[in-house]
């Protein structure tokens, strides 16, 4: 049977804090555990998820976690299912809310001597206790003229008088925490002797040298005073005007008129009303000078026929906000139809070729007017002027393939060779008109070429096959100087290609015929056994009917290939002694000898006093040092062949003789001693 070792239990939890409902199960076989909330399976989220068999809450939520949780363990094999005890959270929370007018129904109904009730919309569990404030000062329950009902969260003022005017706020606290009102209530109960606003001045935007009017009226018993001030607190009256407000007039009803407005008149104007009692009322309004900036440039636009496109006109910065309209051919666009204006956008629906042209965006306000043109091109699908033709191009010469098309805007042409895009390089060039030039035609250029001409409206393509007319040429050209080994068999190849397979023959440069032991077999000159007389100049001639003949001259040298008479041996030398590395080579022409030591050629002219290369090829190194150790290579070469042989040189410390060693004891390796 399935047994719960740990069962979930109901518990207090704090809104937004961690919590854990424990569940641990013991069963004969494997089981899977899941949780129910009010009978429905609980799905894991980042906030609430299974942790082993328990249910973990990263942040308790009073709405999503209210209800009954139950842990269910199921053995899927047997179908046995066990359910834990139910558990729920007692979630403690507090949530801020506004201060609202409960009585009377609207602010307009508040009169002196009426009862006013405000409600604090802070809620929570457990129910919090409330504290009221006016203008930040706490209101205690026992004070005159107001009562606080904590149960209804209400503050009642009876009767309400001007002295109750102010900003009302509330705070509440509970075991969970504290919260204060998210929005406060301003109670304003008029005193007849206090100045009250009848007409407030409004911000004004005017063009330079135009006139501006600000209206301002207050009421009170007895009537209040009214004064106008400009930014720098200078009073404006009909008797004393500041120098920069010479054209200002204050009317009996409180209105202020400014004529021929200039930039220096822009700024904040204050209208101040003062009743017999109470604070002065200061009303502000700003005079702005109208302005309009330049419009940004439009990029030319390319559209395709049949599509719908929009061009947005960004109005220039300006005051007041400039109005925007579009014109085409001097006519303002309508707000509906196929080509019309929508907001600041020019809309072209189902575009026709005839829609191409210049469209103008206008922007205007009190400060003036601005305009900007946009050039609209309606793209057309390219049409052929000249398609690429199947062509025969000569090898080694430039070749051209045409791809001439016309469209609006000018079409772009790309070429493909064997379905691969041709990128322009030293061999390929695409001219402005679309023609492809192959700078030096090669045999493998014989293939399919395709050109594609495109505009935003569409593309056309055509292909052509190129056949390369091969030039008559040696493949590869024979080496002009070649060596043959004396008394050995030798071959000298010569092959050529052309439009037609060429015939190939060899002859001696002096015109004499080839000896009988020398054969010419399909272009390969074969010497059965090379003699000294075979040396000389030979010519390979390749010819065919259409292309004539070509010649290649070869100078054959008969040589005795190099052999070493003496080779250097592995040598060990005491430090400070002299090393001799012998090397002698023979061959015809007589070989020259070079030495390579420590991976660099030893230049006889730059050897220094310690090293010397003898006429016979041997290398001597005096006063050897450990750094002279290494491999030394003797290289023998002549005009026909090169051969090398190498040996290591070891430089060792001279041993101190021990008494046990007789004077005749040989060293354990071959030594050169001097």
């Amino acid at each position: 049977a399935i047994v719960f070792i740990k069962q979930p239990s109901s518990q207090d939890a704090l809104q937004g804090r961690r919590a854990l409902l424990r569940c641990e199960v013991e069963a004969p076989g494997p089981v899977h555990v899941y949780w129910l909330l009010d009978g429905a399976p609980v799905q894991d989220t980042e906030r609430r998820f299974a942790q082993g068999s328990s249910l973990s809450f990263a942040a308790v939520d009073r709405l999503q976690d209210s209800g009954t949780f139950q842990c269910v363990a199921r053995d899927d094999v047997t179908g046995e299912e066990a359910r834990s005890a139910n558990a729920s959270f007692n979630i403690k929370w507090i949530e801020a809310g506004p201060v609202v007018l409960k009585h009377p129904a609207s602010e307009a109904e508040i009169q002196p001597q009426t009862q006013v009730t405000l409600r604090c919309h802070i809620d929570g569990h457990p129910r919090p206790t409330y504290q009221w404030f006016r203008d930040g000062t706490p209101l205690s329950d026992g004070q005159s003229n107001h009562t606080v009902s904590s149960k209804e969260r209400n503050l009642t003022l009876r009767p309400a008088g001007p002295e109750h005017s102010g900003l009302y706020s509330c705070c509440a606290h509970s075991a969970f925490g504290q919260a204060c009102s998210s929005q406060n209530f301003t109670l304003s109960i008029a005193d007849e002797s206090f100045a009250r606003v009848v007409l407030a001045p409004q911000d004004v935007v005017v063009a330079r040298y135009e006139e501006a009017m600000f209206h301002c009226q207050f009421s009170a018993q007895p009537p209040p005073s009214l004064q106008w001030l400009f930014e720098d607190e200078t009073p404006i009256t009909n008797r004393s005007r500041p120098p920069h407000l010479r054209r200002a007039t204050v009317f009996a009803n409180g209105s202020l008129l400014l004529t021929q407005v200039r930039p220096r008149n822009a700024g904040i104007y204050r209208c101040i009303g003062q009743g017999q009692r109470g604070p002065p009322i200061i009303l502000e309004a700003t005079l702005h000078l109208a302005e309009i900036e330049d419009m940004p440039l439009f990029e030319p636009r390319v559209f395709t026929a049949g599509s719908e496109e929009r061009v947005t006109c960004l109005p220039p910065k300006g005051l007041p906000e400039p109005s925007v309209w579009w014109e085409h051919a001097g006519v303002r666009l309508p707000t509906h139809g196929r080509v019309y204006q929508k907001g600041h956008e020019l809309v072209l629906a189902n575009i026709a070729e005839s829609d191409a042209g210049v469209y103008t965006c206008h922007a205007a306000n009190l400060a003036g007017q601005r305009r900007q043109d946009v050039n609209i091109t309606v793209a057309t699908v390219p049409s052929w002027l000249k398609k690429p033709q199947d062509s025969q191009l000569e090898e080694g010469k430039p070749g051209y393939l045409d791809c001439l098309t016309q469209a609006t805007p000018k079409p772009t042409v790309v070429w493909y060779r064997n379905q691969m895009l041709i990128s322009e390089d030293s061999r390929f060039e695409v001219f402005k008109n679309g023609t492809l030039r192959i700078n030096s035609v090669e045999v493998y250029d014989g293939t399919w070429y395709r050109c594609m001409s495109s505009t935003p409206a569409g593309s056309i393509e055509a292909q052509a096959r190129v056949q390369v007319l091969e030039k008559l040429k040696f493949t590869p050209p024979p080496q002009p100087q070649q060596c043959m080994e004396f008394d050995k068999e030798a071959t000298v190849p010569c092959s050529a290609t052309g439009r037609e397979k060429p015939t190939i023959k060899w002859e001696r440069a002096d015109g004499s015929s080839l000896p009988e032991w020398v054969t010419d077999n399909a272009g390969t000159l074969h010497f059965a056994r090379v003699t000294r007389d075979d040396a000389g100049n030979y010519t390979c001639i390749a010819s065919n009917g259409p292309q004539g003949q070509i010649r290649a001259h070869v100078q054959l040298t008969v040589a005795v290939f190099i052999t070493f008479k003496v080779e250097p041996e592995r040598t060990t030398v005491y430090q400070g002694h002299t090393a001799l590395l012998q090397c002698e080579a023979q061959g015809d022409p007589k070989p020259l000898i070079q030495w390579k030591g420590k991976d660099r050629i030893l230049d006889p002219t730059k050897l220094g006093p310690r090293m010397h290369i003898f006429q016979n090829g041997s290398l001597v190194i005096h006063d050897v040092a450990p750094e002279d150790s290494g491999r030394y290579t003797c290289i023998a070469g002549n005009s026909c062949n090169i051969k090398h042989t190498e040996a290591p040189l070891y430089v060792v410390d001279k041993p101190v003789p021990e008494e046990s060693e007789g004077p005749g004891s040989p060293p354990p390796y071959k030594m050169i001693q001097t």
Epitope: P30, H32, Y34, G39, P41, Q43, D44, V72, R74, D75, D76, V77, T78, G79, E80, E81, A82, R83
Partner: antibody, heavy 112, light 110 residues
Framework: EVQLVESGGGLVQPGGSLRLSCTAS????????MNWVRQAPGKGLEWVGI???????YYASWAKGRFTISRDTSKNTVYLQMNSLRAEDTAVYFC??????WGQGTLVTVSS | EIVMTQSPSTLSASVGDRVIITCQSS????????LAWYQQKPGKAPKLLIY???NLASGVPSRFSGSGSGAEFTLTISSLQPDDFATYYC??????????FGQGTKLTVL
């Protein structure tokens, strides 16, 4: 001996209703989950729904609305009520306790 | 809607062969391991082979094994025996007490 026996299958006309029973012996339904699974002739297994140990039911999306699983713990029997039957509901209907214990199945044929 | 896809749908093999059947689910199974494999022979109720992805059911030979996690699972028969030619089904369990079967793999003699 622990076993399950299905009954109530038979021929029914399209649009008709049928109630299948699955009687359990050797164990009490109130501690176990019971599945209904069906298999159309020559086709694969298709899960219909489940009733858990508390009597809550869950269904395959295609079965919701037409099929209802219930139980009577006093009779130790699980039921499958099938309404608005169609030709494609023709199948052998199995009841199963968990994954291991299956009944022999009962054939339902929907045909006019 | 949950879809479980078994592959291959049919499989021909010989006695002694190693056979692998895969089961892919359109969403992860519960706890990444709530998956079972059944064997069914014609006219019989399905027989449980593997439960919780890799556990061998009572009386099932050890040549059967299961593996996988999340949404991809495999059933392996290490050395096919004559009695193993049958149809095999995978079954997954999902959040919200929802279950689903694969379409089945029919294993026949080559």
């Amino acid at each position: 001996e622990v076993q399950l026996v299905e009954s109530g299958g038979g021929l029914v006309q399209p649009g008709g209703s049928l109630r299948l029973s699955c009687t359990a012996s050797g164990f009490s339904l109130s501690n176990y989950v019971m599945n209904w699974v069906r298999q159309a002739p020559g086709k694969g297994l298709e899960w219909v729904g489940i009733i858990d140990s508390s009597g809550s039911t869950y269904y395959a999306s295609w079965a919701k609305g037409r099929f209802t699983i219930s139980r009577d713990t006093s009779k130790n029997t699980v039921y499958l009520q099938m309404n608005s039957l169609r030709a494609e509901d023709t199948a052998v209907y199995f009841c199963a306790r968990g994954l291991y214990l299956w009944g022999q199945g009962t054939l339902v044929t929907v045909s006019s | 809607e949950i879809v479980m896809t078994q592959s291959p749908s049919t499989l021909s093999a010989s006695v002694g062969d190693r056979v692998i059947i895969t089961c892919q689910s359109s969403q992860s199974v519960y706890n990444n391991n709530l998956l079972a494999w059944y064997q069914q022979k014609p006219g019989k109720a399905p027989k449980l082979l593997i439960y919780y992805t890799s556990n061998l059911a009572s009386g099932v030979p050890s040549r059967f094994s299961g593996s996988g996690s999340g949404a991809e699972f495999t059933l392996t028969i290490s050395s096919l025996q004559p009695d193993d030619f049958a149809t095999y089904y995978c079954q997954g369990g999902y959040h919200g007490n929802i279950y689903a079967f694969g379409q089945g793999t029919k294993l026949t003699v080559l």
